[in-house]
């Protein structure tokens, strides 16, 4: 039977009742245009939602839009439109909301072709109210806040100028003309590309790159011939074109881009390029892409430095630059990403990583599934994950794969069953232990979230029909109930709960359609009923991560160390609660060659430990840049794997001798940086 | 030459189940997915699902789902169909097709279909009480 | 599921004159689709494949057109043989679908 229908699946006692006590409908009085909404601050159950409407007039577009108030999770909204003087809000900017609990929030504003500046409107107090402030340029990007100070904003303008504001918005500066590109790095720095001769696409590869550490009033160019640059992590990476060629490579400071160093890894053609998949304070992971439209390429990791890299997958799906890849960081289990490839057949596979792209493998087979017509062999297949890829390629797949760093272990996504993702429609699948293991929790594309830390799962079938039932599950999704939310059937457009998957409400979105008119209309359900008792000590039991072979003394150690949580017990019907936080109890492994990854001029042969000399290098000394000078190094092939903890056990020697020697081949290196100040 | 012979004629009570068979020849058999479309008296074509026969792997139809099981014969070069809980509106004419796309996704060069190239001659089914 | 639609459901058409055959389908399909043939107590027979590529042995006055949603199968100067009924499939995503059949008949 399907999941959920087996007789031994316990009802939640008397659950429509509670549900129905805690269903709250909000229909916004609006034609149905798009809507737009925004969580602002944590834990504060303040939403700001934005509808738009556009008429098509014979000359022009008349837009109108209303902004929505609510305060208590999305239950009830007040119109506050009138705080925002009526005024048309443009969409393509979003709402931009202030980093943690700041309450700040901006508003950018549609403007008539002839003002001199573009309109915002501003507040500080979580949108009870709003400052209108008139701006001495056009925007072209949306407001973006320093991590470290909401006070502090820099936009681009559609002049190409870098604008800062050091009072949220209230006052405007104009630091840098012909900027392409702009970020905060920390410590409230910014780094940004400027052009020298025409427009940002005419210089592309001769731009220069500077920083400003004082918002404005100095700079210093930290780089030139630079193509793209980016921010990963504790990592400032840039794309910097070759002396001769049309090829570029990347180099890599951790210093805010004082010291650059040459990235050990492929340089790129024109039609190529780079991408940061994902990037921590230990490491990188960096796919390149193939030569010619191959739609692929391959992922290499980085080592502390992000200097020496290690191919980590071959024929890594990745479309174009700025296209689909379905890289996904598993946030509910340590060391856990997902992606997928393209196989010789041009059929797409889907690999998984537990140790930090070490390892790669096929995801097992759910044990309640059978291969699909893909399979080559009906006993032997995998599961396959569907992400951003089938998203863009319209399959059946309404939501991209699901964690949550509080919901320990838990992954949710559409896939199927065979040797390939497959055309027909998915089903969505769980996984308890951050991937190694997985089962079928519905039939059918739906759309799902995760409340109270992982206690409740809510999911709604896809479909394009009407729809009025919500589905939702107390054990991570082996047993589910279904709960009619309201008689009238709506189109349904989404789900929307707090980020971070503490809260216990959940907003269906959707618009109603008469005759006459169509309106947005939303059904906020709090599920704090269902879960009536808090959770005490004996709701929770120890789960070791990563564990594989109980018998073994090293079962669950990756990266150097294990972890045992404390997990909740399916069976248990509680509150985590709000204030949740995850418990851990970490213990240190001793090292073993798999804690090391191959150094510069080593590599791994597959399905072997041991690193070995890259033939090609053989009997030459190992010679690399590193800050621009020429490095030797001594080496018997392994480093530590970035954020390894392992003590003792295996221990290769490894030495860097500095041979006082300029490197010829760095564009980044000190003497070709400059200073200036405004 | 290539050709898909079905079983013959079969007259079913409702609730029973009928299995039709489809032999394949002058091809390699395992290098070809199998489909299954019926057809009824009057009406268009109806895609009921797939079977890879290299590991008998199947995708059906929502519609069919529970009641259909396609499977295959390595050694017979032959693929059958059989269709459980029969009613009156299973009242069809059954045709194997050689699909030899399959059903993978494919990468961003874009899945090339080529049809159901080649077709059985059918298996007419009348459930009636 | 992909729905397919195919109009007109009925063409009336002279030897030697041309016919044109529409499809539409309810979302992009891309160039995943085929065209085929089926004359009473026959098994349907395919025409064309990746929306516009003549299979193996099939006569050049039939040709096809289109991609995402919108098909056309061209018969560029009927014969006698060639009064039959026409479907289009998708097979783009699962289930596989056919459009509900365009009868050419003579006028």
């Known amino acids: 039977s399907a999941p959920g229908e087996d007789e031994e699946c316990g009802r939640v006692r008397d659950f429509v009742a509670k549900l129905a006590n805690n269903t709250h409908q909000h229909v916004f009085d609006d034609l149905r245009g798009s809507v737009s909404l925004s969580w602002v601050g944590d834990s504060t159950g303040v939403i700001l939602v934005l509808t738009t409407f556009h008429v098509p007039l014979v000359i022009m577009t008349f837009g109108q839009s209303k902004l929505y108030r609510s305060e208590d999770y999305g239950k009830n909204f007040k119109d506050i439109t009138d705080l925002i003087n009526n005024t048309f809000i443009r969409t393509e900017f979003g709402m931009a909301i202030g980093p943690e609990n700041s309450g700040k929030v901006v508003l950018t504003a549609e403007v008539s072709g002839g003002s001199r500046g573009g309109r915002i409107f501003r507040s500080s107090d979580f949108a009870k109210n709003f400052v209108q402030t008139d701006l001495p340029f056009h925007p072209l990007t949306q407001m973006m806040y320093s991590p470290q100070n909401s006070d502090y904003l820099l936009a681009l303008s559609t002049e190409n100028g870098l604008w800062v504001s050091k009072n949220f918005g209230g006052k405007w500066e104009e630091i840098h003309k012909a900027v392409c590109l702009a970020k905060w790095g920390s410590d409230n720095t910014i780094f940004f590309t400027t052009y020298a001769n025409g427009s940002c696409k005419a210089d592309l590869g001769a731009l220069e790159l500077w920083r400003t550490s004082d918002l404005g009033k100095s700079f210093k160019t930290i780089g030139v011939k630079i193509y793209s640059f980016g921010l990963g992590g504790r990592f400032l990476f840039a794309s910097v074109m070759a002396d001769k060629d049309t090829t570029r490579r990347i180099h890599v400071s951790t210093d805010q881009g004082d010291t650059w160093s040459m990235a050990q890894l492929p340089s790129v053609g024109q039609e190529q390029f780079y991408s940061i998949l994902a990037a921590n304070d230990d490491m990188v992971f960096m796919h390149v892409d193939e030569p010619g439209d191959t739609g692929f390429g391959t992922i290499f990791t980085s080592d502390d430095r992000g200097i020496v890299y290690s191919k980590s997958l071959d024929r890594h799906l990745y479309t174009t630059t700025g296209g689909e890849t379905d890289f996904t960081n598993v946030t509910s289990l340590r060391g856990v990403y997902i992606t997928s490839v393209l196989s010789e057949d041009n059929s797409i596979q889907t690999m998984i990583t537990f140790d930090q792209g070490g390892r790669w493998t096929h995801l097992r087979k759910p044990e309640n599934s059978e291969c699909d017509a893909t399979a080559k062999n009906k006993n032997e297949c995998s599961l396959h994950i569907h992400a951003s890829y089938s998203i863009s390629q319209k399959l059946n797949v309404p939501m991209a794969p699901l964690s949550e760093p509080n919901a320990v272990g838990i992954v949710i996504a559409h896939g199927s069953v065979g040797d390939a993702i497959s055309v027909m429609v998915p089903d969505v699948y769980i996984s308890d232990d951050g991937g190694y293991s997985w089962t079928k929790m519905l039939e059918g594309p739906h759309y799902y979230t995760i409340l109270d830390s992982g206690g409740i799962i809510v999911a709604i079938e896809h479909s394009s029909r009407p729809i009025n039932v919500i589905k939702f599950s107390t054990d991570e999704g082996q047993c589910w109930q279904t709960y009619t939310f309201t008689r009238d059937p709506i189109y349904f457009t989404g789900l929307a709960s707090e980020p971070g998957a503490r809260s216990m409400n959940i907003s269906i979105w959707g618009f109603t359609e008469s005759f006459l008119t169509s309106q947005w209309v939303s059904y906020t359900i709090d599920f704090k009923d269902i879960l009536e008792r808090n959770c005490e000590e004996k709701d929770y039991t120890i789960w070791l991560a990563h564990s594989t072979d109980p018998e073994d003394y090293e079962d669950g150690c990756i990266l150097g160390y294990k972890e045992q949580f404390l997990r909740l017990r399916k069976s248990s019907v509680c509150q985590n609660g709000r204030d949740y936080v995850v418990t851990k109890q970490p213990s240190i492994c001793l090292c073993s060659l798999e804690d090391f990854l191959c150094d510069f001029g080593y590599y791994r042969p597959e399905n072997d430990s041991k690193c070995v000399e890259q033939p090609e290098l053989k009997g030459h000394d190992l010679e690399f840049c590193l800050y621009g000078r020429e490095e030797h190094l001594t080496t018997n092939g392994y480093r530590k794997i970035p954020g390894d903890k392992c003590q003792g056990g295996v221990n290769p020697v490894r030495e860097v001798k500095d041979l006082k020697k300029k490197c010829t081949s760095n564009f980044l290196s000190p003497e070709k940086q400059n200073s200036k100040s405004n | 030459q290539v050709q898909l012979v079905q079983s013959g004629a079969e007259v079913k009570k409702p609730g029973a189940s009928v299995k039709v068979s489809c032999k394949a020849s002058?091809?390699?058999?395992?290098?070809?997915?199998m489909s299954w479309v019926r057809q009824a008296p009057g009406q268009g074509l109806e895609w009921m699902g797939i079977i890879n026969p290299i590991g008998g792997s199947t995708s059906y139809a929502q519609k069919f789902q529970g009641r259909v099981t396609m499977t295959r014969d390595t050694s017979a070069s032959t693929v059958y169909m059989e269709l459980s809980s029969l009613r009156s509106e299973d009242t069809a004419v059954y045709y194997c097709?050689?699909?030899?796309?399959?059903?993978?996704?494919?990468?961003?060069?874009?899945?090339?279909?080529?049809?159901?190239?080649?077709w059985g001659q059918g298996t007419t089914v009348t459930v009636s009480s | 599921e992909i729905v397919m639609t195919q109009s007109p459901a009925t063409l009336s058409v002279s030897p030697g004159e041309r016919a044109t055959l529409s499809c539409r389908a309810s979302q992009s399909v891309s160039s995943n689709l085929a065209w085929y043939q089926q004359k009473p107590g026959q098994a349907p027979r395919l025409l064309i494949y990746?929306?516009?590529t003549r299979a193996t042995g099939i006569p050049a006055r039939f040709s096809g057109s289109g991609s995402g949603t919108e098909f056309t199968l061209t018969i560029s100067s009927l014969q006698s043989e060639d009064f039959a009924v026409y479907y289009c499939?998708?097979?783009?995503?699962?289930?596989?679908?056919f459009g509900g059949g365009t009868k050419v008949e003579i006028k």
């Open positions: 002058g091809y390699t058999f395992t290098k070809y997915y």
């Open positions: 499939q998708q097979a783009r995503l699962g289930p596989w679908t």
């Open positions: 990746g929306a516009s």
């Open positions: 097709a050689r699909d030899p796309s399959g059903i993978a996704a494919a990468g961003p060069a874009g899945r090339y279909y080529y049809g159901m190239d080649v």
